[in-house]
């Protein structure tokens, strides 16, 4: 079975993640895009997509390169660089980006229901949309035998990257960055993402997608997670930034708006492409850590609230054991410090993707539909693409974040990492991830980014009555995005910060859905490799600045289901925002301990730079996913 997690289309460009991990070769990438009646994007097309809010924290193929589109600096995404970050040494499998010329000019979050150009085959292919809807079909799209019967499934990477693009500078990065908007966001919106103005839909929807008579099943999952991860741009804030252990390949593309205070998030499109396999950089899924992360970004990067549901509240602690590295994508501090309004053109070459974008355990949340009907929270189903950013604006009331939605984690949830992971050159242990030297970019992406979850391990979120629960913020979008979780047994949601950027501008219903992921730790995970288990939700406090509430989510085990529920305890808290670091775009939290700055002349739009945070290491497959507490 193949699960393809796809994001909204931004100017035709979208991100595809296969099976919740970096597992696509260059040849397969071309075949996959072709199956979607698309092509690999050119650099120009990717740059344009980025201009309307597309960003992810996952390495993916485009024509001639492996890149990560970044709008907001995030220490764990593209080494804090912005623009189209190019991985110059790509020697393994990645996700892919595709370009559909017939897509709408801005964000298109309508559900993709099938692989139009797939041919007959025995493979069960599940297309998982951002909103959590799932469509299943039998077929095949791969033409290269090596992709179908890989000799080295884990690290095979046919990806190519012209060495000519490597920067002569140390670090081997070529940064083609673009200047960002005002780098200093308001305190209120650390999560803010410029890419989204859409107001996220506020309600979480529990979807129990009912399978249609045909093989195609559509399942909407709650946008709850995406809501959790959306930047403040979207009115609705999902302040819970907890990551579910099982990382799903899907990234939460809905922008969350932690609070109205989280300002720019919604403007940013949370184009969380993919499941956040990236280096955790853009994904919230990996961003949740059991230890509270002090986010000082609240005041600094209000402009960037995309992934941090309550970015402005440093107090908010994500207690999930998974990493929070991505969470700060939009951290305000990073926003101020890292964003250079006059940054360089959006082309960034990153020599070692493993450092930054290696998949980290992304949170995978499996939502159990409360009913068989697919319900989309009040959010519009249209995803604004990867970010939910079109921003369903969530009203302050919505910002109360109906976090009442319970996240039920199966009893196995405690073992999100049981999924086997195969160390890949990109992979590194969580420990390494935090080692600035080894991975300035947040090296444990792969190892730590995704938590492998068996279906039994996947956490299911059960939508609560509170419609606001599933809010996802978009920078522009004010409406809440409903997040739909996938119900597939093994499927879990992974939230990508990237996708979480809020896009208030584009109301869309976003749901975090993930394809089945065995890997909790980033990188490609060997299904046979069992990772240590971690408690997915240990409880987290989400702050809803606009409601001035701080909600503490306490995992509750359901006597009936044994699954965890999340209980929200509202604590009066003035304008506290969930950790901004939740925003994948926020740089503030730089696991590597150093921000990667982009250096370059504005004139040519290219900057060459090395990660200053530490030496880039491609050290390999040390994937011991040790989730830092």
């Amino acid at each position: 079975q193949i699960d393809l997690n796809i994001t909204c289309r931004f100017a035709g460009v979208f991100h595809v993640e296969k099976n919740g991990r970096y597992s696509i070769s260059r040849t397969e990438a071309a075949d996959l895009c072709k199956a979607f009646n698309s092509t690999l994007p050119t650099m120009a097309q990717m740059e344009k997509a980025l201009s309307i809010g597309f960003e992810t924290c996952r390495y993916g193929f485009i024509e001639g390169h492996v890149v990560i589109p970044r709008i907001h600096p995030n220490s764990i995404c593209a080494a804090n660089n912005t623009g189209v970050y190019i991985l110059t040494s790509n020697t393994s499998q990645y996700d892919t980006y595709c370009f559909n010329a017939s897509a709408p000019p801005e964000e298109d979050c309508t559900s993709v229901t099938d692989l139009p150009n797939a041919f007959d085959g025995p493979i069960t292919i599940t297309i998982v949309n951002r909103d959590g809807t799932r469509y299943v079909q039998k077929g095949e799209y791969r033409t290269n035998p090596e992709d179908i019967y890989p000799s080295n499934p884990t690290d095979d990477d046919v990806s190519s990257g012209s060495s000519s693009e490597r920067s002569s500078t140390s670090g081997g990065y070529i940064f083609y960055t673009f200047s960002t908007v005002h780098p200093i966001p308001d305190e209120d919106s650390p999560w803010i993402t410029d890419s989204t103005d859409r107001i996220p839909a506020t309600t979480l929807m529990s979807t129990s997608a009912t399978a249609t008579e045909t093989a195609t099943k559509r399942q909407e999952t709650w946008d709850w997670f995406s809501w959790l991860f959306l930047p403040s741009e979207s009115k609705n804030h999902l302040h819970t930034t907890t990551q579910m252990a099982g990382t799903s390949s899907n990234t939460i593309s809905a922008g969350w708006e932690p609070n109205e205070e989280n300002e720019d998030e919604r403007d940013r499109h949370l184009s969380f492409s993919g499941s956040g396999i990236d280096d955790d950089e853009d994904f919230i899924s990996s961003t949740i850590s059991t230890t509270p992360r002090a986010f000082d970004h609240t005041k600094q990067n209000q402009d960037w609230t995309q992934w941090n549901p309550s970015h402005s509240n440093p107090e908010v602690l994500l207690q999930t054991t998974t990493r929070m590295t991505d969470v700060d994508r939009n951290g305000t501090t990073a926003y101020e410090g890292n964003w250079n309004p006059e940054a360089h053109p959006p082309l960034i070459h990153h020599e070692h993707h493993e450092e930054e974008e290696t998949p980290h355990s992304t949170s995978t949340i499996q939502a159990t539909p409360s009913s068989t009907t697919e319900e989309t929270a009040t959010q519009k189903e249209q995803w604004f693409g990867n970010r939910w950013h079109e921003g369903y604006r969530q009203t302050p009331k919505e910002d109360s974040h109906s976090t009442t939605g319970t996240a039920a984690a199966s009893a196995h949830t405690s073992h999100p990492m049981q999924g086997r992971t195969t160390p890949s050159p990109e992979d590194s242990s969580w420990t390494d991830f935090f080692n600035p030297i080894s991975h300035p970019m947040g090296r444990g992406h792969q190892a730590g980014r995704r938590m492998d979850m068996d279906s039994s391990h996947s956490i299911t979120l059960q939508p609560t009555a509170n419609p606001n629960t599933g809010l996802v913020e978009d920078l522009d979008r004010t409406g809440p995005l409903s997040m739909t979780t996938q119900q597939s047994n093994s499927q879990s949601f992974s939230t990508s910060h990237e996708g979480l950027e809020e896009d208030k501008d584009h109301p869309t219903t976003s749901t975090l859905t993930s394809s089945n992921r065995n890997d909790v730790t980033g990188g490609r995970r060997d299904p046979n490799h069992s990772e240590g288990s971690t408690t997915l939700l240990e409880g987290y406090t989400s702050h809803y600045p606009h409601t001035k509430e701080s909600r503490t989510f306490i995992p509750v085990t359901s006597a009936k289901t044994g699954s965890f529920g999340v209980t929200a305890v509202t604590v009066g808290d003035s304008n506290s925002n969930v950790n901004r670091s939740l925003s994948g775009d926020q740089d503030t939290f730089h696991p590597s301990g150093g921000s990667h700055t982009t250096h370059g002349s504005e004139s040519d739009g290219h900057s060459h730079g090395s990660q200053e945070g530490g030496a880039n290491t491609t050290s390999g497959p040390i994937r011991t996913p040790q989730i830092p507490e």
Epitope: F178, D194, D197, E261, N262, D476, E502, K504
Partner: antibody, heavy 119, light 107 residues
Framework: QVQLVQSGAEVKKPGESLKISCKGS????????IGWVRQMPGKGLEWMGI????????RYSPSFQGQVTISADKSISTAYLQWSSLKASDTAMYYC????????????WGQGTLVTVSS | SELTQDPAVSVALGQTVRITCQGD??????ASWYQQKPGQAPLLVIY???IRPSGIPDRFSGSSSGNTASLTITGAQAEDEADYYC???????????FGGGTKLTVL
């Protein structure tokens, strides 16, 4: 630093053509959309259209479609707004502004070009 | 205009004032706010949910509820006297719309 510098004021007669410019600097010009906004004397802001210099993708406000032409020359990081036949009602201050990545917000603005059309 | 603003609002020096912007598209998109002083180009002061660009005083804040976006100036200063415009996407999401503007007078 990011700057949008517009061409100087213009005084034209009805029926004449005109092309005003907006030169961007301090950032990757081809990577950001540039919008044009009109402000008639004593009035509010009106969005006219927007262009992506990278590929010249252009969108117009329904109110200005067919009335003006927006273009760009990425080689010189300049966007243009032109009229083939000016009318007195075109008298206004015209601003170019850079769109934020993603949302339709404008973070940097040019100083404005005053166009006066009078017989 | 798809976005409606009160033509004029006044506030006493040091007091708090709220300028509103209404429009159906605001249910889906956040508004941004611009300050324009006589003879000057507009200046972005708030965007997204409540984001202030660098250099914008923290007395400016934004909020949104339903179809209404609000710009609040807490402790208005004389230099805040200006015209304020809101903008957002139109209902299609592909175009930009501006409100008619609100002239703020600081007494």
């Amino acid at each position: 630093q990011v700057q949008l510098v517009q061409s100087g004021a213009e005084v034209k007669k009805p029926g004449e053509s005109l092309k005003i410019s907006c030169k961007g600097s301090g950032y990757s010009f081809t990577s950001y959309w540039i919008g044009w906004v009109r402000q008639m004397p004593g009035k509010g802001l009106e969005w006219m259209g927007i262009i992506y210099p990278g590929d010249s993708d252009t969108r117009y406000s329904p109110s200005f479609q067919g009335q003006v032409t927006i273009s760009a020359d990425k080689s010189i990081s300049t966007a243009y707004l032109q009229w083939s036949s000016l009318k007195a009602s075109d008298t206004a201050m015209y601003y170019c502004a850079r769109r934020l990545h993603g949302p339709f917000y404008f973070d940097y603005w040019g100083q404005g070009t005053l166009v006066t059309v009078s017989s | 205009s798809e976005l409606t603003q009160d033509p004029a609002v006044s506030v006493a020096l040091g007091q708090t004032v709220r300028i509103t912007c209404q429009g159906d598209s605001l249910r889906s998109y956040y508004a941004s706010w611009y300050q324009q002083k006589p003879g000057q180009a507009p200046l972005l002061v708030i965007y997204g949910k409540n984001i202030r660009p660098s250099g914008i005083p923290d007395r400016f804040s934004g909020s949104s509820s339903g179809n209404t976006a609000s710009l609040t100036i807490t402790g208005a200063q004389a230099e805040d006297e200006a015209d304020y415009y809101c903008n957002s996407r139109d209902s299609s999401g592909n175009h930009v719309v501006f409100g008619g503007g609100t002239k703020l007078t600081v007494l």
